[in-house]
């Protein structure tokens, strides 16, 4: 049975201050370690308890990290991405893509599905338009009676 999972995709700038044990998260991905099919991006695999990221609360497991201190993470080897974080300094600015699931359906491992999804407005706008047209038609019909 093939289901479809739709996502609301949002971006956010997250500024973290490195704590005593660092930034407090793990990553997967890179050109040599694709985690999502046809996407060599860097994803948050683990948020460490009581770490800087966990205490801040905005970064989530599954988020895609687009840049670190303005440096793009596209087309990087996994270890190069790790090194970039480790050398990022005390104040670290992350550009992050959140993906919120808005419709349940069968889904496998993140790496096995289509990561793109559909932004929710793509679904809501046509539904809203159809509703308005139907309401207008109904009102016209009533006026003719």
């Amino acid at each position: 049975m093939n289901g479809r999972v739709d996502y609301l995709v949002t971006e956010e700038e997250i500024n973290l201050t490195r704590g005593p044990s660092g930034l407090g998260f793990n990553i997967v991905g890179g050109t040599d370690q694709q985690y999502v099919s046809n996407d060599s991006g860097i994803y948050v695999s683990r948020i460490k308890e009581n770490g800087a990221a966990a205490l801040d609360g905005r970064l989530q497991e599954g988020d895609k990290i687009l840049s670190v201190n303005g440096q793009d993470l596209k087309n990087l080897l996994h270890q190069d991405a790790v090194d970039l974080f480790r050398n990022a300094g005390y104040a670290v600015s992350l550009r992050v893509q959140h993906r919120l699931q808005v419709q349940n359906g069968p889904i496998g491992h993140r790496g096995e599905g289509d990561p793109s999804g559909i932004p929710i407005f793509m679904v809501l706008v046509p539904v809203f338009a159809l509703t308005m047209v139907a309401a207008w038609a109904f009102m016209r019909y009533r006026q003719q009676l």
Partner: nanobody, 126 residues
Framework: HVQLVESGGGLVQPGGSLRLSCAAS????????IGWFRQAPGKEREGVSC????????YYADSVKGRFTISRDNAKNTVYLQMNSLKPEDTAVYYC????????????????????WGQGTQVTVS
């Protein structure tokens, strides 16, 4: 359900060898860093060796460099620790641990980064 099971420990004479195995179930090793740690009576748990989640880079504590070798077999979902030229000071309970992805903060020899631990296997060199 993530589970790690160590085996291969035992009693060995100084200069002898042992091969420890860490069998993983409930997940595949592909995206996991795996570490071997040990704890001797009355001492803190220390990192022995680990293998990264990405390119299979290996790391060793200074005390075991040149004597211990870590390797992974993704097909068997198992990580091995080959221990040669064993010394009495290698006596400890040996644990394997797994962590999803790579920590952006520290190398895989840092035991605080690991989420999943096995029950341990006793190694005695005497």
């Amino acid at each position: 359900h993530v589970q790690l099971v160590e085996s291969g420990g035992g009693l060995v004479q100084p200069g002898g060898s042992l091969r420890l195995s860490c069998a993983a179930s409930g997940f595949t090793l592909d995206y996991y860093a795996i570490g071997w740690f040990r704890q001797a009576p009355g001492k803190e748990r220390e990192g022995v060796s680990c293998i990264s989640s990405s390119d299979g880079s290996t790391y060793y504590a200074d005390s075991v460099k040149g004597r211990f070798t870590i390797s992974r077999d993704n097909a068997k979902n198992t990580v091995y620790l080959q221990m040669n030229s064993l010394k009495p000071e290698d006596t400890a309970v040996y644990y394997c641990a797994a962590d999803f992805g790579s920590s952006v903060d520290s190398t895989c020899l840092n035991n605080q980064q690991y989420d999943y631990w096995g029950q341990g296997t006793q190694v005695t060199v005497s």
